[in-house]
Every structure is written in structure tokens, then in C-alpha cells.
Amino acid sequence: VPLDPISVSNSSSQIILKWKPPSDPNGNITHYLVFWERQAEDSELFELDYCLKGLKLPSRTWSPPFESEDSQKHNQSEYEDSAGECCSCPKTDSQILKELEESSFRKTFEDYLHNVVFVPRKTSSGTGAEDPRPSRKRRSLGDVGNVTVAVPTVAAFPNTSSTSVPTSPEEHRPFEKVVNKESLVISGLRHFTGYRIELQACNQDTPEERCSVAAYVSARTMPEAKADDIVGPVTHEIFENNVVHLMWQEPKEPNGLIVLYEVSYRRYGDEELHLCVSRKHFALERGCRLRGLSPGNYSVRIRATSLAGNGSWTEPTYFYVTDYLDVPSNIAK
């Protein structure tokens, strides 16, 4: 198994993957296979109302660049806790002995996996990205080497511009074949999106490819600068009883997903008032309604908040509210 894979993002469309060769390979490592797939955002993000008081905005950070060649495990790999980044303590004698035993066990276990679990598979020629990856069959052996990925379904908002749920994980996943090096720059990725990366070491560069159990690591690309900005005008409609319906377009390709909108409005000469519009409320009304407005000139600005933070405020939109008791009843309904 390739050791200590670390992945970092250096831009909104790239992830850099680095690893170390297996400690005790079976024969010569001829190449590595790197597969990646986009991860759906947690389904609770689509359901929770982040406008509720006391509900903290979800913390989603991208994978920061390397500090040095040896700063391993910047971002969590599967089953790791991401609670904090700490230095490793000096190893005790018992730990060193234990690691030597584990190294010996790993060698034996890899031999076992090679011979018992995996059936060698053929890969088609040509560029990896076009290869639909002929199925690498596994013989059933309980849960050995079996990693399950829970992909949340986004049932509540099927039509909003959010991260889509990937189709069957084994099908048509992009991959790269890496020869003579222990690093890869994965390009052409979506901004501020989590990716699950699978890395295998292979020791036979023939149609009967023999590859190790996969090592897994996760990373998130960096945010795109203006992706959370509301594009297009903020429009309004004035209804009876001085109700103003404000409407705007959801950012087309936000950083992750939009969790809420802030609406800031003020009557000329008065202090600014704020409304928080959740995903659900926006979806229901395509905006929000201001009710009980006193007559006068108003300005309104709106900004979106995504998993990566706030977008920019829109340019102010202006509207005038009349004293509806004094006007004929032909105001737009």
C-alpha cells in the first residue's frame, strides 16, 4: 500500500497528491493508479436552517498547501479525526518495536491480499481518463479491504445549483497512471468541492495488472473568488398593503452550496434593517417579502453565504413605498 498519502489544494481547480512508496513492496513498483471522485455535500446542509439563532454556519475549509515535504497528513484520510493539526510526539521504544512488527505484518498481509483477494485485471490502453476501468473483481472475504462510502442524497432540493451526487462509484471515475514519481497534480476539478482520492501501487505493467489495496485520502479544492456573488439584478414587486417582494438569482456555481442570504434594507433617513433568508425560504419564494413598510424611499442590498463564506453585497436596488391608503387600488398584485 502506498504510504502517507497527503493531498492539498493550491487552486480552485487543482489538488496536489503526494505519497511515499510502500515500505516492503512485492517486487518492483512499476506505476501507481490514482482515482478520484467528487463527494456530495452532507445532506444535512440542505435541510438545516442556518438562519436560526445559535446555529453555527458549517465549517468547511479547503486543504491548505504543504508546509514542508514531511508535514504529513494535513487533511484527514478515511477514519482520521480532523480535530486539529498537531506535531507528533517522540516515539517510545515500545512504539518503535510495535512499528517494526506492523511493518513485517503489512508485508505478509499484502502478499496474502495479492494472492487471495484480488483477481488480476486488464486495463485498456489509451488515456486513463477515458478508460471506464474494467471491473476489478474481488473475491468475497468478509469485510477485508472493503471501504463503504456513504453518499447522502439531496432529496429536498433536487433542482438547486448544489453539488450533485456522483453516480455509481466504480463507474467512469477519472484516473491517472503515475510512473516514476510519487506525486500527481489533479486538474480540472470543481471549485470548493470535496474529492475522495484512491491510490494504488502496482507491480506489473502488463495487461494482467497487479495492484495493491487502495489508500484513501480526502481533499477540498480552494474557493472561487466570485462564485458566491449574486449575478443579475435584484428585482422587486410592490403588492397591496405595502408588501414588497424582492427577487434575485441564486449564484449558478457557488462554493459548495448557498446556505443563506442576508437582506439589508433601509428607508432613507432610518437605520439599516436585516433579514436572513434560508435556503428553504428562498426556494419557496424565489426571494423574500418585506411587509409593513412605512411610506418612503428604500434601498436594499443582498449577499449570499456559502460553505466558503460570504459573497459580495449586490449593488443597492431602490424602490418607493407609497401610503397605500391614499392610492387607487391598481397597484400590482
Epitope: C51, N159, E237, E262, A283, L284, E285, R286, R289
Partner: antibody
Framework: EVQLVETGGGVVQPGRSLRLSCAAS????????MHWVRQAPGKGLEWVAV????????YYADSVKGRFTISRDNSKNTLYLQMNSLRAEDTAVYYC????WGFGFDYWGQGTTVTVSS | DVVMTQSPLSLPVTLGQPASISCRSS???????????LNWFQQRPGQSPRRLIY???NRDSGVPSRFSGSGSGTDFTLKISRVEAEDVGVYYC?????????FGQGTKLEIK
């Protein structure tokens, strides 16, 4: 003048289906989310379902999830509630109501009575 | 879901006298933007519900000034300064802060 008129209620046996309609007039129907709210005999009000202005987003009360379907036809200014697998506890007056975010429901229909009985 | 509890459930009042209905929520109704989405509805006998008050204390158009709403957080009150015959019916509080919207059980106001 805003008007909401429900139709389609009646007496139906348990397990059967019924479709309610709500005809809207006097406002731009396609700009508003719409709700169904029900009231069992002698009881309080219970929210049933809501549909967004375009019809693409729908939410249901747990008590009707999987059995009831809310839909709308903006070209006909009409809201619908398809009720399947009806139970005795679905017996109620069903109101359609216009949505105002946070402020609840600013206009209600007169209601249509659904009685589920064998 | 947020539970709304009203009291009293029955309120006999003499014409011209004041009346007060209490509504308590199981969670705070203050939204992140500091607005409180608590509404009051009136349902006269044989009629549909009608909204009287929105956002705790704002009267809907056409609602007589004898109706007033107050409160904050989890405790709210609807007051009628002088009850008139046309006020007979059931009054419901409803919260619009948390999803789904939920109603109180209703308070039946009747004339003594």
C-alpha cells in the same frame, strides 16, 4: 380581491384516494408558495404541505409523507392535493392558504370537507 | 417540531371587558436576523382562519385596534382591550420561525 376556492372533498372509504383542488384568483399565483392546512372536527389547525412558487420544491408533514402529493398548475392558477391511502384520521376540513414567509398564511380558502369512513 | 401551548383553552368574557390569551413555545422564536415570527389567527364559527397579528405585534390591515400582540422569546400574549360580539371564535398562535410551522391548540373565546 384575493380569492381561494377549494373543491373535491367528499366521503371516501379508508385506503381509497381523493384529489382536492384550489382555484386562485386576484393575485399573481405563480409568485407565491401555497399550503394545505387541515382541521379535524372540533380540533385545531394542522399544517399538511407546501409547494414553492414554481412547483419544484415540496415539503410535507410527517403524518402525510408518502401518501399525499401537493402539486400546482400555474397556467390554470390551481393548487392540488392528491391524497392516497386515506385513513380515518385524515378526516378534516382542508384549507388551501397563501404563503407568506415567516408570517404564515395571509389568505385562506373557505375549506372543503374530507370524510374517511367505511 | 416546536410545540405551541396556549392558555386558557376556554375564555368566557363579558362584552366590553378585556381578554388576554397566552401562548408559549417550546423553543425561542427569535430568528437569526432578530425578527420573531409569531402570528395570531382568529377563526369565527363556521369560517376560515384569518390572520390578525404578524411578527408578535404588527396588526394586519383591517384588524381593529382593540387587538394587540406582545411578548418575546418563548412567551407571547394576544390582548383584546374591549371584547365585542364579533370577536367570538377560536384564536390560534402560530410560529413561523422553525420548520414546519406549528399552531397552538386554540383558545375558544365566548361571551358570558
Amino acid at each position: 380581491e384575493v380569492q381561494l376556492v377549494e373543491t373535491g372533498g367528499g366521503v371516501v372509504q379508508p385506503g381509497r384516494s381523493l384529489r382536492l383542488s384550489c382555484a386562485a384568483s386576484g393575485f399573481t399565483f405563480s409568485s407565491y408558495a401555497m399550503h394545505w392546512v387541515r382541521q379535524a372536527p372540533g380540533k385545531g389547525l394542522e399544517w399538511v404541505a407546501v409547494i414553492s412558487y414554481s412547483g419544484s420544491n415540496k415539503y410535507y408533514a410527517d403524518s402525510v409523507k408518502g401518501r399525499f402529493t401537493i402539486s400546482r398548475d400555474n397556467s390554470k392558477n390551481t393548487l392540488y392535493l392528491q391524497m392516497n391511502s386515506l385513513r380515518a384520521e385524515d378526516t378534516a376540513v382542508y384549507y388551501c392558504a397563501r404563503h407568506e414567509w415567516g408570517f404564515g398564511f395571509d389568505y385562506w380558502g373557505q375549506g372543503t370537507t374530507v370524510t374517511v369512513s367505511s | 417540531d416546536v410545540v405551541m401551548t396556549q392558555s386558557p383553552l376556554s375564555l368566557p368574557v363579558t362584552l366590553g371587558q378585556p381578554a388576554s390569551i397566552s401562548c408559549r413555545s417550546s423553543e425561542s422564536l427569535v430568528y437569526g436576523d432578530e425578527n420573531t415570527y409569531l402570528n395570531w389567527f382568529q377563526q369565527r364559527p363556521g369560517q376560515s382562519p384569518r390572520r390578525l397579528i404578524y411578527k408578535v405585534s404588527n396588526r394586519d390591515s383591517g384588524v381593529p385596534s382593540r387587538f394587540s400582540g406582545s411578548g418575546s422569546g418563548t412567551d407571547f400574549t394576544l390582548k383584546i382591550s374591549r371584547v365585542e360580539a364579533e370577536d367570538v371564535g377560536v384564536y390560534y398562535c402560530m410560529q413561523g420561525t422553525h420548520w414546519p410551522y406549528t399552531f397552538g391548540q386554540g383558545t375558544k373565546l365566548e361571551i358570558k
